[in-house]
């Protein structure tokens, strides 16, 4: 099975225990790291962070060690936009120009391939997006021929079923890409005004509709009916949390809510914990397991979070063999208990070490 | 099928310049690059250089670096090899090439001998 | 002076197995996929052997290919006749972003 695991280069300025850089990963705990994100200037492919090079080189120092780790780069993201992305894929030259930068750029640096993180297509770019996808990949063939190792390509799919719709010809774009990570997290947010587990693994009793989309096992199985293979398709599961403020004394799923929850001290997102601000929350917090979703969820206070535990990882798992699936994907490295000294465990990355061994289990 | 048919054999002198061509037919020109390979009289092969037909971007070896201009014209499927400042060393075979993994083409060769 | 080495010359007799060899660097064979070719007198090359150790179609089972760190080997077994030619090894170097051959073997089948 793959495990497929993302780094953000700007974990690097968290303060204090909360900083990470690649250094600090663990070569022998996936088979793919994803760097994030680089960007694109002036139709190449570039990088984002001032020391993004010097990053690199430390990433890719870790296959010294392990020459079987792949590390691919992520260009794109949340912070790129769509709308850049859209006029590079639109326009014939630009989009010629950006796909011929890219092998060269990722050799220089010593990635194994490029992921591709357009955050979200939209219905009139579904069409660019296939070609970007295709004409990529015809390109890695053809900078391959001469003996090279073929650079891989995959790209990060969105697991909400109206975003597929509308941006993914899944079918054609699963023929082109190495394997497809799809963000089956982020399901719930503040704007849902009620509590709600942000990765549940099934769609809880709760759930009235739209909810019925909005769970891990209805987004895979729809990626599967709309023609991805089993075999390329990377099952995400998140090691961060979504929090909210609770508006009542309710706290149940479903409650009524003010707004996102407190930032972490470290991560210092409104909404968002990582798993290890997580371990330091449920010191007093109360645990619930929403039982027909499979995730935990804590209260403290006003607080509320769902998050994703090393059972509930365990769970995905399984889930995700039973479907004969490629493997799992972690969004992020950063997020998890890097350093092993915030969860109690003496265990680096404890929720990315469950997903290995559960992985490795027979 | 597949064919990389070159242009005929050339008796040129020293200083000269020859160009040889390299149609093809029977696949998609801007699939593969295209690469130049020469064999001298009882030698080896040498790679000279490879061209992109999608966008005409080259790679040259640093031996014919400044002597050589590989170029392909999509109109026609055709690749070219020019090879400038012609000297008695440079008397071969030229062949036309998509080189390493299948499909692994091959023209048939040209003939070029640099005599005074 | 090529960048990959192979030996000038090897030979052996009808039916017996031979291998030639072809020593490069972490740059060329360390990093990337090798191929091998055949070259029958008068004739172009034709790959045998790719991505170390595959066959295209239409190449007899009798041809095979290896690698270990900066060095490759192709094997022949059952030396026909036929046989009789020229072997490259051949790969991209990655340090001078071009592709580099061997100095060719001259195979001669005994008898």
């Known amino acids: 099975y793959k495990l497929v695991c993302y780094y953000t280069s700007w974990s690097q300025y968290r303060e204090g225990d909360g900083s990470c850089f690649p250094d600090a990963l663990d070569r022998f705990l996936c088979t793919h790291i994803i760097y994030s994100f680089a960007n694109i200037s002036n139709d190449h492919i570039d990088t984002w962070e001032w020391n993004d090079v010097t990053l690199y080189g430390m990433l890719n120092t870790l296959k010294n060690r392990n020459p079987n780790l792949k590390t691919l780069l992520s260009v794109g993201g949340w912070n790129f936009g769509s709308q850049r992305f859209s006029k590079i894929a639109s326009n014939t030259q630009s989009r010629r120009t950006f796909i011929k930068s890219v092998p060269p750029f990722l050799r220089t640096h010593g990635f194994d391939g490029l992921d591709l993180a357009w955050l979200y297509p939209g219905r009139r770019d579904k069409q660019h997006f296939t070609t970007l996808i295709k004409e990529m990949k015809a390109e890695f063939i053809k900078e391959a021929q001469p003996g090279k190792k073929q650079l891989l390509l995959s790209a990060a799919l969105s697991a909400g079923k109206v975003t597929i719709d509308s941006s993914y010809d899944i079918a054609k774009i699963s023929q082109h890409l190495d394997f497809i990570s799809i963000m089956t997290y982020d399901f719930h947010g503040a704007w849902r005004g009620t509590t709600g587990h942000h990765s549940p693994l099934f769609r809880g009793q709760e759930d009235a509709s739209p909810d019925r989309f909005s769970n891990t096992d209805y987004a895979v199985g729809y990626m599967l009916r709309l023609g991805a293979p089993a075999s390329k398709l990377v099952m995400g599961i998140p090691t961060f949390g979504r929090s909210f403020t609770l508006a009542s004394s309710e706290t149940g799923v479903g409650a009524p809510i003010s707004g996102p929850g407190i930032p972490g001290r470290f991560t210092k997102e409104a909404g968002t914990l990582a798993y290890y601000e997580i371990c330091d929350f449920l010191r007093g917090a109360t645990v619930h397991r929403i039982l027909g979703q499979q995730v935990p969820y804590a209260t403290k206070g006003n607080q509320w979070v769902g998050y994703d535990d090393q059972e509930s990882v365990k769970s995905k798992v399984q889930y995700l063999k039973d479907r004969q699936l490629a493997g799992a994907m972690v969004w992020a490295l950063d997020l998890d208990d890097f350093q092993g000294s915030f969860c109690g465990q003496d265990l680096r990355f404890p929720l990315t070490n469950a997903i290995k061994d559960a992985l490795a289990a027979t | 099928e597949v064919q990389l048919v070159q242009s005929g054999a050339e008796v040129k002198k020293p200083g000269a310049t020859v160009k040889i061509s390299c149609k093809v037919s029977?696949?998609?020109?801007?699939?593969?690059?295209m690469h130049w390979v020469q064999q001298a009289p009882g030698k080896g092969l040498e790679w000279m250089g490879l061209?992109?037909?999608?966008?005409?971007?080259?790679i040259y070896a640093e031996k014919f670096q400044g002597r050589v201009t590989i170029t392909a014209d999509t109109s026609t499927d055709t690749a070219y090899m020019e090879l400038s400042s012609l000297r008695s060393e440079d008397t071969a075979v030229y062949y036309c090439?998509?080189?390493?993994?299948?499909?692994?083409?091959w023209g048939q060769g040209t003939t070029v001998t640099v005599s005074s | 002076q090529s960048v990959l080495t192979q030996p000038p010359s090897v030979s052996a007799a009808p039916g017996q197995k031979v291998t030639i060899s072809c020593s490069g660097s972490?740059?060329?064979?360390?990093?990337?996929?090798v191929s091998w070719y055949q070259q029958l007198p008068g004739t172009a090359p034709k790959l045998l052997i790719y991505?170390?150790?595959k066959r295209p179609s239409g190449i007899p089972d009798r041809f095979s290919g290896s690698k270990s760190g900066t060095s490759a080997t192709l094997g022949i077994t059952g030396l026909q006749t036929g046989d009789e030619a020229d072997y490259y090894c051949?790969?991209?170097?990655?340090?001078?972003?071009?592709?580099?051959f061997g100095g060719g073997t001259k195979l001669t089948v005994l008898g």
């Open positions: 061209v992109d037909p999608e966008d005409g971007e080259t």
């Open positions: 051949g790969t991209w170097d990655s340090s001078l972003s071009v592709w580099v």
């Open positions: 991505d170390n150790n």
């Open positions: 972490s740059s060329n064979i360390g990093n990337n996929y």
């Open positions: 090439a998509t080189i390493g993994r299948p499909p692994d083409y």
């Open positions: 029977g696949y998609t020109f801007t699939d593969y690059y």
